[in-house]
């Protein structure tokens, strides 16, 4: 057990050009307060992923207004540092998120107004008991200085707080091989007890023998690297055996979310949708308030009116559930045009357009004609993000380029025989029609239904269609 | 000294059920794996898997899943292996073996207990 | 699984000259090799651990070698004592697997 502890040194405008605008002003003064969010491993996970190290939410800062005409400053910061405490062994490599949250206090209707102005995240390794690591970081303009440490808790000692401390058996020394407990140096470090081989990196111990692996590490004694390329099975959950994800029973079988959270498959294990007043993976924390930092991917919490409801998460766009801990599918809604495909990206949707479309939902259809040329005196024909040519008579093909046969489509009606013609076809109807296709039939007395042939031209005769 | 004392020779029917069992004495029974080996002429040996008897922890070979059970009673400092819907393939010598405190990999065995399935 | 292939399964040969048997794992196992001594009558005996760090009274003329996938059992200067079957046994990944065993005959 123990604690990761953070400590803002300052928030303000980044190097270079393009400097923010102070987010107070005289008309709406605000106070600044932090977020940090802390998950084991280095993997990459998604921003909506549970806080499976913990979470906390600073104290607000002092009320600042903006100087008329001054550059932003560094704002003013809440005292104090973050501190999120952990129960298990510190897996010394974590990744964490660090929101600067804003908090308006104008003349609001129903109270302040919040927003986030600054999200930063990283991932990085970090051994217990060491020093402070200083670290930078920049979100648009802004730029977060910050250390961060994490130190175990008595009896706790090492670099992942699993090594245990005893007060000395006598009062001059530690026994052989056993070293003081700093700081606490009337107490001596506890014989190692773990399996035999459990590796020092990767692996570590809380009962007498045993080697359990820190994330990312599998076999006897945490030798070996978890690996999913030889699995044969996507589903979970990950096994000690294989360190592969290896098949089973399903992940949600016999329902590991308590309090009456509800039970949803992912790629990776499971997810519980907890009700109000719990969270956690399982929703077996409770008793939950704002200080907890319940609220994930930047939900604000708000103090519930009443004891059953300790606390309200304001979900910002694109997250919902009692914790703020689920994405929306905004992609569902198909906002992308002109079959356009949606993605969501977490900050933002990005749609990427067919050949021919643009704009940030494909709503813009290109001009399909610029720089396109039809030959043989064919026109352009805008449409469906492709050019088309209408060609002159005679020719064919995507740019006209082709010298069509006129008689390929067969144009001469009621078994009309078809004859390519320097200037384009002739149909020689069949008895009883007439007209330059055949379409028309002849009328038993001689007269046409329609206009009479041309001059010079009985029916039957082939008809030139020009 | 370090010893593990295993139960004698077994003979049981097709289908039945059987409990051997291994007996550690000498250090603190708690703290080390239990190992358990199959032996067959022709196949060498065989890792069935493994207990920590201090927090019934438990590894097994996937081929021994549904076949073989262990347990572990601190207070008689004993553990214990149960097969299950005995064949004639599950006749064979079973050893119990202990990983070192300080040793990565198996101390000291047990002398081995001799199961045989015939109906 | 990791496989060990073990050789040679016989091996016949007379006191005072050197032996070796050879394991090779399917995959590396880094040095998280063991050797063990079968004898009749008498319980498994551990020679060798972490692929080549000698166990405590085990005589000096067991040696082992090797790491990765390719690993080596020397016994220099055979002794009446030695002939037995020999495993080596891989305890980097679950399951822990064994070699098929060699069998040192008296020439």
């Known amino acids: 057990a123990g604690v990761f502890e953070l400590q803002i040194h300052s928030f303000g405008p980044g190097p270079g050009p393009g400097a923010p605008r102070s987010p107070c002003s005289a008309r709406l003064p605000c106070r600044l307060f932090f977020r940090v969010c802390l998950k084991p491993g280095l993997s990459e996970e998604a921003a909506e992923s549970p806080c499976a190290l913990g979470a906390a939410l600073s104290a607000r800062g002092p009320v600042y207004t903006e100087q008329p005409g001054a550059p932003a400053p560094d704002l003013p910061l809440p005292d104090g540092l973050l501190q999120v405490p952990f129960r298990d062994a510190w897996p010394g490599t974590f990744s964490f998120i660090i929101e600067t949250w804003r908090e308006e206090l104008g003349d609001q209707i129903g109270g302040p107004a919040w927003s986030l102005l600054a999200r930063v995240a990283g991932r990085r390794r970090l051994a217990a008991g060491g020093p402070w690591a200083r670290d930078i970081q920049r979100a648009g303009a802004w730029e977060l200085r910050f250390s961060y440490r994490a130190r175990c808790e008595p009896p706790a000692v090492g670099t992942a707080c699993t090594r245990l401390c005893r007060p000395r058996s006598a009062p001059s020394r530690c026994g052989p091989g056993l070293r003081p407990c700093a700081p606490l140096e009337d107490e001596c470090e506890a014989p190692l007890v773990c399996r035999a081989g459990c590796s020092p990196e990767h692996g570590f111990c809380e009962q007498p023998g045993e080697c359990r692996c820190l994330e990312g590490w599998t076999g006897p004694l945490c030798t070996v690297p978890v690996s999913t390329s030889s699995c044969l099975s996507p589903r979970g959950p990950s096994s000690a055996t294989t360190g592969c994800l290896v098949p089973g029973p399903g992940p949600c079988d016999g329902n590991p979310c308590a309090n009456g959270g509800s039970c949803s498959e992912t790629p990776r294990s499971f997810e519980c949708t907890c009700p109000r007043g719990f969270y956690g993976l399982r929703c077996e924390v409770s008793g939950v308030t704002c200080a907890d930092g319940p609220c994930f991917n930047g939900g604000l919490c708000v103090g519930g009116a009443d004891p059953d409801s300790a606390y309200i998460c304001h979900c910002p766009p694109g997250f919902q559930g009692s914790n703020c801990e689920k994405r929306v599918d905004r992609c569902s809604l198909q906002p992308c045009r002109n079959g356009g495909l949606c993605l969501d990206l977490g900050h933002a949707l990005r749609c990427r357009c067919r050949a021919g479309f643009a704009g940030p939902r494909c709503e813009h259809d290109l001009d399909d004609c610029a720089g396109r040329a039809c030959a043989n005196g064919g026109t352009c024909v805008e449409g469906g993000g492709a050019h088309r040519c209408s060609c002159a008579l005679g020719f064919g093909g995507r740019d006209c380029r082709e010298r069509a046969d006129p008689c390929a489509a067969r144009p001469c009606a009621h078994g009309g025989r078809c004859y390519a013609h320097f200037s384009g076809l002739v149909c020689a109807c069949a008895p009883g029609y007439m007209g330059a296709r055949c379409e028309f039939p002849v009328h038993p007395d001689g007269a046409s239904a329609l206009p009479a042939a041309p001059p010079g031209l009985r029916p039957g005769d082939p008809q030139r269609y020009l | 000294q370090v010893q593990l004392q295993q139960s004698g020779t077994e003979l049981m029917k097709p289908g039945a059920s059987v409990k051997l069992s291994c007996k550690a004495t000498g250090y603190t029974f708690t703290g080390n794996w239990i190992e358990w080996v199959k032996q067959r002429p022709g196949h060498g040996l065989e890792w069935i898997g493994e207990?920590?008897?201090?927090?019934?922890?438990?590894q097994y070979n996937e081929k021994f899943k549904g076949k073989a059970t262990f347990t572990a009673d601190p207070s008689s400092n004993t553990a214990y292996m149960q097969l299950s819907s005995l064949t004639t393939e599950d006749s064979a010598i079973y050893y119990c073996?202990?990983?070192?405190?300080?040793?990565?990999?198996?101390?000291?065995w047990g002398q081995g207990t001799t199961l045989t399935v015939s109906s | 699984d990791v496989q060990i292939t073990q050789s040679p399964s016989y091996l016949a040969a007379s006191p005072g000259e050197t032996i070796t048997i050879n394991c090779r794992a399917s995959?590396?196992?880094?040095?998280?090799l063991a050797w063990y001594q079968e004898k009749p009558g008498k319980t498994n005996k551990l020679l060798i651990y972490?692929?080549?760090t000698l166990h405590s009274g085990i005589p000096s003329r067991f040696s082992g070698s090797g790491s990765g996938t390719d690993f080596t059992l020397t016994i220099s200067s055979l002794e009446p004592e030695d002939f037995a079957i020999y495993y080596c046994q891989q305890h980097n990944e679950y399951p822990l697997t064994f070699g098929g065993g060699t069998k040192l005959e008296l020439k």
């Open positions: 995959k590396s196992i880094s040095k998280y």
């Open positions: 073996a202990r990983w070192g405190s300080t040793v990565v990999a198996y101390d000291y």
């Open positions: 972490s692929g080549s």
């Open positions: 207990i920590l008897p201090g927090t019934g922890s438990t």
